[in-house]
């Protein structure tokens, strides 16, 4: 039960940040003009990773696209990759988590391999989780470093006669947003992770065989037979007593799961 | 068309009050915010500030916050610039404008007339 | 505040010449987002209220003859009136929409010679 509910949250979680991911990727306020110490204008500028808007005080809104690929920052284009990828992993992990659920019956799928589904989309998620902080970050690294270069030339003019304020942009919106939703797909990840480890089937170390004897059957209890070594080992159970002759009826039946006899 | 039909003139006796009305027609009223511009006799255009009825927001340039204050009433899609305490330099028209894109202000009331006079 | 000063004061010109008007601002009016000016140019004749001839310092307004024209970025504009007409006699003023507070120029008298 615990299990089920770690995954089930986990792909909320997950869920939840790739949404996020997306919507910050998408969002116009990575960069806003700073408003701080600065003569208040009537035009209020904003940026984004794929445009540029400017929003007068008329209310009116005039966005522009970045047109250009080659003319763009490398930094800028760093960061779109980044968003890119993690946008592309996490829908990916949820797609494979889907299947991966516990409570989604898919034909006869074994645990085992809901267990496997659940590591990868962990994984998956946490990459994407990881490359949405990581551009998010470069992007603010890129901001600060503008801040204060802009800062320091922030008044430059013709022999001191004439000022030109240039503009300097701060935080948006959009970088919180990428950095709680590139946590929140970690933290999905991670407890798609954990959920894993409780869905693996751990194979018992002393499996019981039926065996059927002539004349009556004889159950054979599992001292009988060499212990398996080790977690999840294929290594055959040998039998080392072998009693009474066999008919033709006779059958080594091989345990499942639940034949414990 | 767009119209902005401004109050008829008004005399006033210095420490009165007057209320300045804007009617806006045409347009929706909510989506533009209305500027007020003071012209004292013979001399050029001030601007006193905004309102945007949208938002509810009001700004006032320096010299004119206390006495002078904006308001607007949607309903009957009107702004109003009411003037307390008059003195005899309040005398200028004044003329309401709509602030349209481009920060521009592309109609103008016909203006009203404040003479304060004792 | 943004100081706009417009030159000159006055400005007498024959029918059929060229006016120009100059306004300079204390504060570049270029924003850099978009890359326009914000700058208008006004026409005032006596006892009317302004109307608008110019924003973004070059985009003339609908309506507006094409003898009206204005140019200049950043500090320094300039509003043109190719061939004046009797029409045009009036007091032009340039306003800047960039900073708060809004300022207008001092404005400039243009009659006819």
């Known amino acids: 039960m615990a299990v089920t509910a770690c995954q089930g949250l986990g792909f909320v979680v997950s869920l939840i940040g790739i949404a996020g991911i997306i919507a910050a990727t998408c969002m116009d306020q990575w960069s806003t003009q700073d408003l701080y110490n600065n003569p208040v204008t009537a035009v209020f500028n904003y940026q984004g990773l794929w445009r540029s808007c400017v929003r007068e005080s008329s209310g009116f809104t005039e966005c522009r696209g970045y047109f250009t690929l080659l003319g763009l920052p490398a930094m800028l284009q760093a960061v779109r990759a980044l968003m890119i990828v993690g946008i592309v992993l996490g829908a990916i992990g949820l797609l494979v988590s889907i299947f991966a659920l516990k409570c989604i019956r898919i034909g006869s799928m074994e645990d085992s391999a809901k267990a496997n589904m659940t590591l990868t989309s962990g994984i998956m998620f946490i990459v994407s989780g990881l490359c949405a902080i990581a551009g998010v970050s470069v992007f603010a690294n890129m901001l600060v470093t503008n801040f204060w270069m802009s800062t320091a030339n922030m008044y430059t003019g013709m022999g001191g006669m004439v000022q030109t304020v240039q503009t300097r942009y701060t935080f948006g919106a959009a970088l919180f947003v990428g950095w709680v939703a590139g946590g929140l797909t970690l933290i999905g990840g991670v407890m798609m992770c954990i959920a894993c480890r409780g869905l693996a089937p751990e194979e018992t170390n002393y499996k019981a065989v039926s065996y059927h004897a002539s004349g009556h059957s004889v159950a054979y209890k599992p001292g009988g037979f060499k212990a398996s070594t080790g977690f999840g080992s294929n290594t055959k159970n040998k039998k080392i007593y072998d009693g009474g002759a066999r008919t033709e009826d006779e059958v080594q039946s091989y345990p499942s799961k639940h034949d414990y006899v | 068309q767009i119209q902005l039909v401004q109050s008829g003139s008004e005399l006033k006796k210095p420490g009165a009050s007057v209320k300045v009305s804007c009617k806006a027609s045409?347009?929706?009223?909510?989506?533009?915010?209305i500027n007020w511009v003071r012209q004292a006799p013979g001399q050029g255009l001030e601007w006193m500030g905004w309102i945007n009825p949208g938002t509810g927001e009001t700004t006032y340039a320096e010299g004119f916050t206390g006495r002078f204050v904006l308001s607007w009433d949607t309903s009957v899609s009107t702004a109003y610039l009411q003037i307390s305490s008059l003195k005899a330099e309040d005398t200028a028209v004044y003329f309401c404008?709509?602030?349209?894109?481009?920060?521009?202000?592309?109609?103008w009331g016909q203006g009203t007339l404040v003479t304060v006079s004792s | 505040d943004i100081v706009m000063t417009q030159s000159p004061d006055s400005l007498a010109v024959s029918l059929g010449e060229r006016a120009t008007i100059n306004c300079k601002s204390s504060?570049?009016?270029?924003?850099?987002?978009?890359?326009?000016?914000?700058l208008a140019w006004y026409q005032q004749k006596p006892g009317q209220p302004p109307k608008l001839l110019i924003y973004?310092?070059?985009t003339r307004e609908s309506g507006v003859p094409d003898r009206f024209s204005g140019s200049g970025s950043g500090t320094d504009f300039t509003l043109t009136i190719s061939s004046l007409q009797a029409e045009d006699v009036a007091v032009y003023y340039c306003?800047?929409?960039?900073?708060?507070?809004?300022?207008f120029g001092g404005g400039t008298k243009v009659e006819i010679k």
């Open positions: 306003q800047q929409a960039y900073y708060y507070p809004l300022t």
């Open positions: 404008a709509r602030l349209y894109y481009g920060n521009r202000f592309d109609s």
């Open positions: 504060q570049s009016l270029l924003n850099s987002g978009n890359q326009r000016n914000y």
């Open positions: 973004w310092a070059s």
């Open positions: 045409g347009y929706t009223f909510t989506n533009y915010g």
